[in-house]
């Protein structure tokens, strides 16, 4: 019972984690304009892995995709790759773990096979979580480096009198979503690996004993009795998260209480 609970909980935690990783990857707010100690602007900038956005105080929001691939920083490409690898591994892990769940019976699948599948999905979840954490951490490190570089020359003089304000970026909501989601996926993976140990059929410490009777011989070999319902589960490939990508690049978002900073 404890094994089933551990496996089930591991699956649910990983599912939430992977949904979070997908959400973080799709979010636009990986980095947001730093408003502390900055001249108050009537525009607010924020950036994601796929596009950068500007929200004006009028409520108008404009987003522009990064339409170049070669022109993007290598670090950004690396973060994208890590997040996508994390999502792909997580998705495969979810698919495998569905069939590995103890509460689901598929034909006469052996417990050893379920144990192996549970271990496989667990490892996939762990790697997926690590990919997400690594991706988010690389991006965060990139932000910190750029932040202090831009702080060093916050105001770059242009022709003596004219000043150009450099926009500084700080951690966006997506980073925190990514860290938490990666952590959840990692925890879920560990739980699956723990559940795997409980699923594996235990080796018996005693040998099979032969009883020789006169006339004919019968050998008794103690072993686990396996019962199967024989019902195949009708598992459906559910959509875990809808990124909600807008088709329009420009949207009029109504003023909110955060419009003025």
């Amino acid at each position: 019972m404890a094994v089933t609970a551990c496996q089930g909980l591991g699956f649910v935690v990983s599912l939430i984690g992977i949904a979070g990783i997908i959400a973080a990857t799709c979010m636009d707010q990986w980095s947001t304009q730093d408003l502390y100690n900055n001249p108050v602007t009537a525009v607010f900038n924020y950036q994601g892995l796929w596009r950068s956005c500007v929200r004006e105080s009028s409520g108008f929001t404009e987003c522009r995709g990064y339409f170049t691939l070669l022109g993007l920083p290598a670090m950004l490409q690396a973060v994208r790759a890590l997040m996508i690898v994390g999502i792909v591994l997580g998705a495969i892990g979810l698919l495998v773990s569905i069939f590995a769940l103890k509460c689901i019976r598929i034909g006469s699948m052996e417990d050893s096979a379920k144990a192996n599948m549970t271990l496989t999905s667990g490892i996939m979840f762990i790697v997926s979580g690590l990919c997400a954490i690594a991706g988010v951490s690389v991006f965060a490190n990139m932000l910190v480096t750029n932040f202090w570089m831009s702080t060093a020359n916050m105001y770059t003089g242009m022709g003596g009198m004219v000043q150009t304000v450099q926009t500084r970026y700080t951690f966006g909501a997506a980073l925190f979503v990514g860290w938490v989601a990666g952590g959840l996926t990692l925890i879920g993976g560990v739980m699956m690996c723990i559940a795997c140990r409980g699923l594996a059929p235990e080796e018996t410490n005693y040998k099979a004993v032969s009883y020789h009777a006169s006339g004919h011989s019968v050998a008794y070999k103690p072993g686990g009795f396996k019962a199967s319902t024989g019902f195949g589960s009708n598992t459906k490939n559910k959509k875990i998260y809808d990124g909600g990508a807008r088709t329009e690049d420009e949207v009029q978002s109504y003023p909110s209480k955060h419009d003025y900073v």
Partner: antibody
Framework: EVQLQQSGREVVRPGTSVKVSCKPS????????IDWVKQRPGQGLEWIGG????????VYNEKFKAKATLTADKSSMTTNMQLSSLTSDDSAVYFC???????????WGQGTLVTVSA | DIVMTQSPSSLTVRAGEKVTMTCKSS????????????LTWYQQKPGQPPKLLLY???ARESGVPDRFTGSGSGTDFTLSISSVQAEDLAVYYC?????????FGAGTKLEIK
Amino acid sequence: EVQLQQSGREVVRPGTSVKVSCKPSGYAFTNYLIDWVKQRPGQGLEWIGGINPGSGDTVYNEKFKAKATLTADKSSMTTNMQLSSLTSDDSAVYFCARRVRGNSFDSWGQGTLVTVSA
Amino acid sequence: DIVMTQSPSSLTVRAGEKVTMTCKSSQSLFNSGNQRNYLTWYQQKPGQPPKLLLYWATARESGVPDRFTGSGSGTDFTLSISSVQAEDLAVYYCQNVYFYPLTFGAGTKLEIK
């Protein structure tokens, strides 16, 4: 058609206060910010501040913070500007305007002339 | 506060001529996030409220004749009227819409000979 209808001209005594109103029509009242601009006779334009009619949040020009108070009434769909401790320097035409894309002001009220006279 | 300097303060031209007026800001109005300049141009005719001509320094407001064009980036901006008409008699203001407080230039008065 978008319109911003302002209240009529006001002649007030120094030291008193006055409330100028602006009633927008032709669009959803809470969807756009309303800004207020001052213009002294024969002079240029000065931005006083803006209000988000949906949330009531305001932003002011520091110069007018002690002078002007911006409010919005969703029930009557009106934005108001209260000017206090009036002096002759406050004699001007006050405009309300709708803030749109590019943070620009696309529709303006006809203006309210406030005259501070003893 | 951002200082907006307009020049000339006034100019007189004949109908049909091309006219150019400039606006300088004390700080760059360019936003790298969307590659736009947050500068607006208005036209104010005598006894009327200002009318929006251009936003984002170059984007023409709907209904504005195409003889009005804006150019420039960062701190230096220009408003050009390709062929001045009698109805263009007005004061033209530029406005910083990037930094608070939003500030206007002193204006350029256009007069027709």
